[in-house]
């Protein structure tokens, strides 16, 4: 007889990423005997919750919890039954709920209570539903990207095992209601609110992070629509041949469009608005989202927000990836340089509705938003964050790494389940000869 090694026992964790436009469930798994190694936790499965984000259920909190049931039922199947009780389950809500919490804290609380009630009905180890701060969202996205790319811990052999300090990747996340930029920096932050000190695997990291509320893709589009209604009577970022009817209440209900709200507007009034395929006017409209007029620090990104110069390589994910992927894949346009990204945005903005539909068959209503989306991404990176051509060359647009979605969810779970120790692990990984 000979010993047959059993496969290592697996552990599981579940995170519900309650974004502004939709909720996604991620199930992670890792070998129980290697839980302190880097790059060991990976995505087991995922599920997109049907319908809108939980913040869209402000008037119907039970609808928010009901919407999660399908994915939770899938989780019961995806996680082995004997592991249910030991599987942590978290729900983290982001900028959609941050906005709701600003405008209607009671509704925000009711939604969180309703989803909490439903999540406690499942046999998992439910550990809470809460709203992440913008800073947490940024930092956990950064942790996810660097964990998956194994930037925190690596071993080499020079007569003995040692851990060289690898450089980390910056992380840029473009959600529906906010956008985050996070990167390692050497100089102390002039604004303490934007600095986070992390101890991971015995290494110290000084990280700059900032989250811009109302600068997520959906809120930006809504703000541009409000500006177009105010200044043009047509929408320069929409394709010519695209015709809409807009209920004013739908445009001005967001706190992000509050500044553009006419004084005495009729929320039930309808306005017809058509596109004009005008890249130059569109660029001007998008420029209006950024203010560079005052900076109380030695340097700023925009809106008076401190930011050190961007340094090192970056991974840009979520709607950054979706926008660039559309330009590359659907439109067949090169986007390797900032100049190409700008040219690609202009190209899309020049297309008529008929031309766009011919390029991307099927009546995809969101097609009308890619011009504004591309213009915004290009301006946010170049003018907003200050990427020049050289720095932009170090940006990769990615949806996944190591078959795991890049976003804040994995970093959040790693943190809450203590899967990233502050102290260095033993050299088990380096001396494993199996």
């Amino acid at each position: 007889t000979r010993d047959v090694r059993e496969p290592p026992a697996l552990k599981y964790g579940i995170v519900l990423d309650a974004g502004s436009s939709h909720t996604s469930m991620f199930i992670y798994k890792w070998p129980a005997d290697k839980e302190n190694d880097t790059g060991i936790v990976g995505q087991h499965s995922s599920c997109d919750v049907p319908g809108g984000g939980i913040s869209s259920y402000a008037d119907n909190p039970s609808g928010a919890s009901q919407s999660l049931v399908g994915c939770l039922e899938q989780a019961l199947q995806d996680v082995p039954k004997e592991r249910h009780a030991g599987t942590p389950l978290y729900l983290g809500a982001t900028a959609g709920m941050r906005l709701l919490n600003l405008t209607n804290p009671e509704a925000s609380t009711s939604v969180l209570m309703a989803v909490t009630h439903t999540l406690t009905q499942y046999p998992f180890d439910f550990r809470g539903a809460r709203i992440l701060s913008g800073q947490e969202e940024g930092v956990f996205g950064w942790v996810t990207a660097n964990y998956l790319l194994e930037n925190f811990i690596k071993y080499g052999w020079v007569g003995r095992w040692f851990r060289p300090r690898k450089g980390t990747l910056g992380a840029m996340d473009l959600g529906g209601a906010s956008t985050q930029i996070t990167f390692e920096t050497t100089s102390p932050a002039e604004d303490r609110a934007s600095e986070v000190q992390l101890h991971l695997y015995g290494q110290h990291y000084r990280v700059y992070t900032h989250s811009f509320l109302c600068y997520g893709r959906d809120q930006v589009l809504q703000r541009l629509l409000a500006s177009a209604l105010q200044t043009h009577g047509f929408h320069p970022c929409w394709p010519r041949g695209f015709s809409t009817q807009v209920l004013l209440g739908d445009v001005y209900q967001s706190p992000c469009t509050m500044a553009q709200r006419p004084q005495n507007f009729n929320s039930s009034a309808r306005v017809s608005l058509s596109g004009s395929s005008d890249p130059h006017l569109c660029r001007d409209l998008v420029s209006g989202l950024f203010s560079f007029s005052s900076c109380p620090f030695s340097r700023c990104s925009f809106n008076g927000v401190f930011q050190p110069p961007v340094a090192g390589n970056f991974v840009a994910f979520s709607a950054f990836f979706a926008t660039v992927d559309f330009l590359r894949t659907s439109m067949g346009l090169p986007v390797a340089t900032l100049q190409q990204l700008e040219a690609a945005a202009v190209n899309v903005c020049n297309q008529t509705w008929a031309q766009l539909q011919a390029r991307v068959p099927g009546q995809r209503a969101r097609l009308a938003d890619y011009c504004a989306g591309a213009m915004f991404v290009q301006q946010l990176l170049s003018r907003g964050y200050g990427f020049d051509e050289r720095a932009f060359g170090g940006v990769i647009f990615q949806k996944k790494a190591a078959d795991t979605a890049v976003g804040w969810a994995l970093g959040y779970m790693l943190n809450l389940t203590n899967l990233i120790p502050a102290d260095p692990p033993g050299l088990r990984k380096g001396t494993d000869f199996s």
Partner: antibody, heavy 124, light 111 residues
Amino acid sequence: EVKLEQSGPGLVKPSQSLSLTCSVTGYSITSGYYWNWIRQFPGNKLEWMSYISYDGDNNYNPSLKNRISITRDTSKNQFFLKLSSVTTEDTATYYCAGGYYRYGLSYYYVMDYWGQGTSVTVSA
Amino acid sequence: DIKMTQSPASLAVSLGQRATISCKASQSVDYDGNSYMNWYQQKPGQPPKLLIYAASNLESGIPARFSGSGSGTDFTLNIHPVEEEDAATYYCQQSNEDPPTFGGGTKLELK
């Protein structure tokens, strides 16, 4: 208020062409919207046929593409349907309708303004 | 083309009761987390009238007793409480892909 009024013959012979007119009042067909033709067969089944957009672009149902044409006369604020080589299968009530994308974080194509309908029989 | 299948073909409901109409699409009519599904009401001798867009959004002027729900391929129109003027044929319609397609209709009669 947007109003659509239809006109055209109620009887067409097989192999001939069916021609219908939709006159729009209360809104200029060049200002916005999509100006559609939809038909409803005797069993009540509805079929979207085509639209001409406010800027003159056409969009046709692929199942009818080689037989259908949609045009407009902007001076009269009218748009027209021509369906060639008709058969008895084309017997239906034909509606013209004004559509647009209803905004609500995304854009939802709806047909909100309808003509009264024209019953067309294809028979020898 | 996306095929829309409605059930039942007809139903009879008493005044004040609930009417539930289902619509199934041959493929998902969702995109980017939004459902591109509309519901229309048609009374004899009249053109269809828009009731609901985006699966659950009530068109202005439509009474709150009408409600829509669902996502992906499965959608439902509920009418509660049913009133006399609701006797009509109801159609679902997807607008996610060209060409827009309609369900076969559900005729609602009052008992």
